[in-house]
Amino acid sequence: AILGRSETQECLFFNANWEKDRTNQTGVEPCYGDKDKRRHCFATWKNISGSIEIVKQGCWLDDINCYDRTDCVEKKDSPEVYFCCCEGNMCNEKFSYFPEMEVTQPTSNPVTPKPPYYN
């Protein structure tokens, strides 16, 4: 392992899709991939009228957008389907939405919003 990097070997697995097909829908997924490629965990979910509906969680493969992210955080503003990825075993157990604010001149003291965490 490279010093300072969290090697991802397993991720929390969930597939809402499988419920209707009576297949095991939750567990721990071992992540496989080329030796020279990085592996990550991900979570994807929807916000239906304030209620969080997890769609999928599991392993994600070598994606520069996931490099060195220890927390699973969605930063896009109001996506239709939320997605985050991270590095480190089971790092997708918790995920959050923390939109990056557009940089504008503050009219008052800026407040850093705390990301809501889901698990």
Partner: antibody, heavy 120, light 107 residues
Framework: QVQLVQSGAEVKKPGSSVKVSCKAS????????ISWVRQAPGQGLEWMGG????????NYAQKFQGRVTITADESTSTAYMELSSLRSEDTAVYYC?????????????WGQGTMVTVSS | EIVMTQSPSSLSASVGDTVTITCRAS??????LAWYQQKPGKAPRLLIY???QLLSGVPSRFSGSGSGTHFTLTISSLQPEDFATYFC?????????FGPGTKLEIK
């Protein structure tokens, strides 16, 4: 690197069943996601279902529900697809395929295919 | 069932050209979209997964983009070995479905 080797071509009568095998070489067979995809002559691709051997329960496309059975034997690293009540429209090449991940990111390793011909 | 459509159904191009194939899903599939190449008598080969991730060993002239319902596969600087049929596939929701294919022929 996983390799998938399928059983040979079959000729079947309408109404009968066929069972195609797919032997995996390489490690971790039990925790791979194995899917079955078919392709009728000159036609497109059709996903039939899949299985993660350690879980044992298969996930089927509604179209084939009740007619297809997908199983896996961890001791021999072999997956099976059985299709019953065969009709002429089932004439196709049947592929077993490994998925990149359990959440089906992409079908990255394909068997060589098994031609199943249904004819009276 | 999510229906996948592809356009064009066939196209002719020359070596060195850049071509773009479009795939549309009848419902949103987020980024659960893969692209395959198939040559006659052979099994399909995965090129791109997760809409834009290039599979290891696939030449960088292949690229994918899109999310939701609209996706594209671009092949830049076409090589003789690229003339084949290309399929998209969604794996967001069962049954996983494929597009009807785009046949890329040499002009």
């Amino acid at each position: 690197q996983v390799q998938l080797v399928q059983s040979g071509a079959e000729v079947k009568k309408p109404g009968s069943s066929v069972k195609v095998s797919c032997k995996a070489s390489g490690r971790h067979f039990g925790s791979l996601q194995i899917s079955w995809v078919r392709q009728a002559p000159g036609q497109g691709l059709e996903w039939m279902g899949g299985i993660i051997p350690i879980y044992g329960t298969a996930n089927y496309a509604q179209k084939f529900q009740g007619r297809v059975t997908i199983t896996a034997d961890e001791s021999t690293s072999t997956a099976y697809m059985e299709l019953s009540s065969l009709r002429s429209e089932d004439t196709a090449v049947y592929y077993c395929v490994k998925d990149l991940t359990w959440t089906n990111l992409g079908l990255d390793i394909w068997g060589q295919g098994t031609m199943v011909t249904v004819s009276s | 069932e999510i229906v996948m459509t592809q356009s064009p159904s066939s196209l002719s191009a020359s070596v060195g050209d850049t071509v773009t194939i479009t795939c549309r899903a009848s419902q949103g599939v987020s980024r659960w979209l893969a692209w395959y190449q198939q040559k006659p008598g052979k099994a399909p080969r995965l090129l791109i997964y997760a809409a834009e991730q290039l599979l290891s060993g696939v030449p960088s002239r292949f690229s994918g983009s899109g999310s939701g319902t609209h996706f594209t596969l671009t092949i830049s600087s076409l090589q003789p070995e690229d003339f084949a049929t290309y399929f998209c596939q969604q794996s967001y929701s069962t049954p996983f479905t494929f597009g009807p294919g785009t046949k890329l022929e040499i002009k």
